[in-house]
Interface confidence: low
């Protein structure tokens, strides 16, 4: 057969738990070059289901800072600027991947972790339970 | 600042690009055990700014399948169930981390990548530009 040098090859993993342990290059490639990150920055104030952003910080996690949305009201803001409790402000949640240092304090060893974060809020019609 | 000692049990990195290249355990720890994943599953229909979910698939990426929200209307649904164009349905976007296989075909080598995804939609008051 044809011998192809190992130039384009894959890094070896010495880890016995392989394939669970992989090499990850943290030099992040950002595919959002054409997007304006500020374009949704004021939605939290202008929404009929406005929210506040809370800083969730954890030095053992990457990214270490995550912003969590908390809906300001149980109801939604109506055309008069008042809270309408016939509607509900609810958080839109998403599962995201983060890296957690494992063992703790190790600069070059992480575990992949799924966490649920609230990204913003939306206004929904409530589910009404009728009592017989 | 406080110096965090380097845990003596940390794996060494032979990689010349260290600390850019780290070891990651892919045996995912899910911290969402107490959450009900279905609890926001119908918000996309019940919202005053409803959205559809589109499957974004990429076999070079982990996770391979990401669901993208697309707002159904430019306006928002009013109390009569009609679209009110005095308000705007807008996507709530979030930057998330994904892993991209690099080099291709390598089962144990990835690069961290940031992508912008639309998680859901919210109803906002439009910004009105007054012409002098």
């Amino acid at each position: 057969g044809i011998t192809i040098p190992r130039n384009p090859g894959c890094p070896n993993s010495e880890d016995k738990n392989f394939p669970r342990t992989v090499m990850v290059n943290l030099n992040i490639h950002n595919r959002n070059t054409n997007t304006n990150p500020k374009r949704s920055s004021d939605y939290y104030n202008r929404s009929t289901s406005p929210w506040n952003l809370h800083r969730n910080e954890d030095p053992e996690r990457y990214p270490s800072v995550i912003w969590e949305a908390k809906c300001r009201h149980l109801g939604c803001i109506n055309a008069d600027g008042n809270v309408d409790y016939h509607m509900n402000s609810v958080p839109i949640q998403q599962e995201i991947l983060v890296l957690r240092r494992e063992p703790p304090h190790c600069p070059n060893s992480f575990r992949l972790e799924k966490i649920l974060v609230s990204v913003g809020c939306t206004c929904v019609t409530p589910i009404v339970h009728h009592v017989a | 600042g406080i110096t965090i000692p380097r845990n003596p049990g940390c794996p060494n990195s032979e990689d010349k690009n260290f600390p850019r290249t780290v070891m990651v355990n892919l045996n995912i720890h899910n911290r969402n055990t107490n959450t009900n994943p279905k609890r926001s599953s119908d918000y996309y229909n019940r919202s005053t700014s409803p959205w559809n979910l589109h499957r974004n698939e990429d076999p070079e990426r982990y996770p391979s399948v990401i669901w993208e929200a697309k707002c159904r209307h430019l306006g928002c649904i009013n109390a009569d169930g009609n679209v009110d164009y005095h308000m705007n349905s807008v996507p709530i976007q979030q930057e998330i981390l994904v892993l991209r296989r690099e080099p291709p075909h390598c089962p144990n080598s990835f690069r961290l990548e940031k992508i912008l995804v639309s998680v859901g939609c919210t109803c906002v008051t439009p910004i009105v530009h007054h012409v002098a």
Partner: antibody, heavy 124, light 107 residues
Framework: EVQLLESGGGLVQPGGSLRLSCAAS????????MNWVRQAPGKGLEWVSY????????MYADSVKGRFTISRDNSKNTLYLQMNSLRAEDTAVYYC?????????????????WGQGTLVTVSS | DIQMTQSPSSVSASVGDRVTITCRAS??????VAWFQQRPGTAPRSLIY???NLQRGVPSRFSGSGSGTDFSLTITGLQPEDFATYFC?????????FGGGTRVDIN
């Protein structure tokens, strides 16, 4: 049903050129990495070239590097292999092969679907 | 690159027999092994991936095992349509490589 159909093979003289095509159907072509694999008469299989789903990344076996070019047209659901400076040792059946998806498991990607192949004969 | 040494190069068997084909990798490839079946004049067909996972639609008489450097494909209860050539394939590292093939003939 996933289908891959190669075309463009034939008899060519040493030093000549050929362009192979692979028409894909039954799946979303633009989602998948694709490959060319060849099989010399009565011999084993040899990976030739790879192209990523977007077409932005390509790889070649050393035996064809500089002579072969892989490309794709996602709007036409078609994979191509431009073969220049052909040699007698390039004589083989050429298959296009799809990389498997890798849902969740991060278990690596193998060739999950293959075409029927097209025969390339390099001879004077 | 990683060499995949497949044995035997051919085997004669009868319908109903149990046939085992082995593949040895030149270095540790963990479980990144796939097996293909190729009937004369047709395209290779994926049977097994990840050493032991059956591709959708493949009969359960096919099974795979092994880890590290030694792998095997077993056909339990050979059927007429199983007479073909079988290839192992490593996808642990570029360049992706294949075994030389094992031809399963009718006895």
């Amino acid at each position: 049903e996933v289908q891959l159909l190669e075309s463009g093979g034939g008899l060519v003289q040493p030093g000549g050129s050929l362009r192979l095509s692979c028409a894909a159907s039954g799946f979303t072509f633009s989602f998948y990495n694709m490959n060319w694999v060849r099989q010399a008469p009565g011999k084993g299989l040899e990976w030739v070239s790879y192209i990523s789903s977007s077409g932005g990344l390509t790889m070649y076996a050393d035996s064809v590097k500089g002579r072969f070019t892989i490309s794709r047209d996602n709007s036409k659901n078609t994979l191509y292999l431009q073969m220049n400076s052909l040699r007698a040792e390039d004589t083989a059946v050429y298959y296009c092969a799809r990389d498997s998806p890798d849902y969740g498991a991060l278990g690596g990607t193998y060739f999950d679907y293959w075409g029927q192949g097209t025969l390339v004969t390099v001879s004077s | 690159d990683i060499q995949m040494t497949q044995s035997p190069s051919s085997v004669s068997a009868s319908v109903g027999d149990r046939v085992t084909i082995t593949c040895r990798a030149s270095q540790d490839i963990r479980n990144y092994v796939a097996w293909f079946q190729q009937r004369p004049g047709t395209a290779p067909r994926s049977l097994i991936y990840g050493t032991s996972n059956l591709q959708r639609g493949v009969p359960s008489r096919f099974s795979g095992s092994g880890s590290g450097t030694d792998f095997s494909l077993t056909i339990t209860g050979l059927q007429p349509e199983d007479f073909a050539t079988y290839f192992c394939h490593q996808y642990s590292s570029n360049p992706l490589t294949f075994g030389g093939g094992t031809r399963v003939d009718i006895n």
